[in-house]
């Protein structure tokens, strides 16, 4: 019995179906086929879970969180024992193993390993201003998404006709910050932050209002 090499890893957007491949060759009839799919979740590597089981001509559910979402892609028994997972969740990310036994065929490699990564587009980022908006002050524009896998990068731009940040601004696309030093009236206006990763983008708008000093009455 020999389980075929599988692609190292599969990426899928959250909510979409994933197919985890596993095929094998055998010299025996498929009368005593026994297939166990296991997962070692990324979120809990010490706690492997059973995903689905085929034994004695019957299918059995694995861990409760997979109930109703998992099945074999083809009619069993077969030499293609790939499975699908519907409505993938972040917690489905992990290393999946198919363990195949088909007595009396023993020996050879009977395990196939596939990694699954569930990708999440950036959630709507939160835009905010840190610091005084008085003229001459330094401000930081903050942008962060609570969700996003891979981790989003953040691009700030000022919505004027240059689409460029003020000349006194420095941007950190990893942290999602823009520091604008010595703000002036020309720093005022509408800014857009775009959070993006491999599978999506999300934006927020922020309004910077630089406050000019009020003339003081003397007397």
């Amino acid at each position: 019995l020999e389980v075929s090499e599988s692609p190292g890893s599969i990426q899928v957007a959250r909510g979409q179906p994933a197919v985890l491949p596993c095929t094998f060759t055998t010299s025996a009839a498929l009368i005593n086929l026994n297939v166990i799919w296991m997962v070692t979740p990324l979120s809990n590597a010490n706690q492997p879970e059973q995903v689905i089981l085929y034994q004695g001509g019957q299918m059995f559910d694995g861990a409760p969180r997979f109930h109703g979402r998992v099945g074999f892609t083809g009619t069993m028994p077969a030499t293609n024992v790939s499975i699908f997972i519907n409505n993938t969740q972040l917690s489905d990310t992990g290393t999946y193993q198919c363990l195949v036994n088909n007595l009396p065929d023993i020996g050879g490699r009977n395990i196939g390993v596939t990694g699954l990564t569930v990708l999440v587009p950036p959630s709507a980022p939160h835009c905010q201003i840190q610091g005084s908006q008085d003229i001459g002050s330094d401000v930081i524009l903050l942008c962060s998404s609570e969700e996003g896998i891979p981790r989003p990068t953040y691009l700030w731009e000022k919505l004027d006709n240059t689409l460029k940040l003020p000349p006194t601004a420095t941007q950190d696309q990893v942290q999602g910050t823009v520091t604008i030093r010595n703000i002036s009236a020309l720093s005022s206006g509408l800014y857009q932050c775009v959070a993006s990763n491999a599978i999506g983008t999300s934006t927020c708008l922020l309004d910077l209002q630089v406050i000019s000093p009020q003339p003081r009455n003397i007397g």
């Epitope: 006709n161 005022s188 509408l190 209002q209």
Partner: antibody, heavy 121, light 110 residues
Amino acid sequence: EVQLLESGPGLVKPSQTLSLTCTVSGGSISSGGYYWSWIRQHPGKGLEWIGYIYYSGSTYYNPSLKSRVTISVDTSKNQFSLKLSSVTAADTAVYYCARASRSTDYYFDYWGQGTLVTVSS
Amino acid sequence: QPGLTQPPSMSYGLGQTATLTCTGNRNNIGDQGAAWLQQHQGHPPKLLSYRNNNGPSGISERLSASRSGNTASLTISGLQPEDEADYYCSAWDSSLRAWVFGGGTKLTVL
């Protein structure tokens, strides 16, 4: 209550420049936080955003019209203006001035009555 | 060509509930939500709701806005003759970097 009122010629010849002014009353353009915009509506059709100006003079135009648009502000008169160059019959529309702000998620909460501009020789 | 798609016309009976739809993409409605505007013949548009179901003061409680994915909806219950108007949706498009509008839906109250 903020009010906006458009004014300008109702007829412009092709290839000339369309010029409109919006006068704001009941609020100051200089108060900040507001994006003073021009939006147009072709006869019997939908709306098209042209561009905005901030009280500081910072402008931002619809990329599809950018090459022909100029918006300016006169805070002393509480007015902002639109110039659209090289007009053709396709620029015939009702032109509205409008205001957007943070409080309405940058959507347009106050509109002028609109002025019909016809491009014809 | 409008950036958002709306059915050109819809008809409902007096007192019925109308649901108007507006379809965009992930860069506009899917990202930012949508605003709804009402326009009576010969009048400027009036903002009804923004960012899905927020609304300016003084707007009828018979109106409700929502979003599902890239589609925004406006529901008007207990239709009155004064609800007969054109309805436009609008959204900020982060890719075009512009406010975009739908082509409008003419609502007729029978």
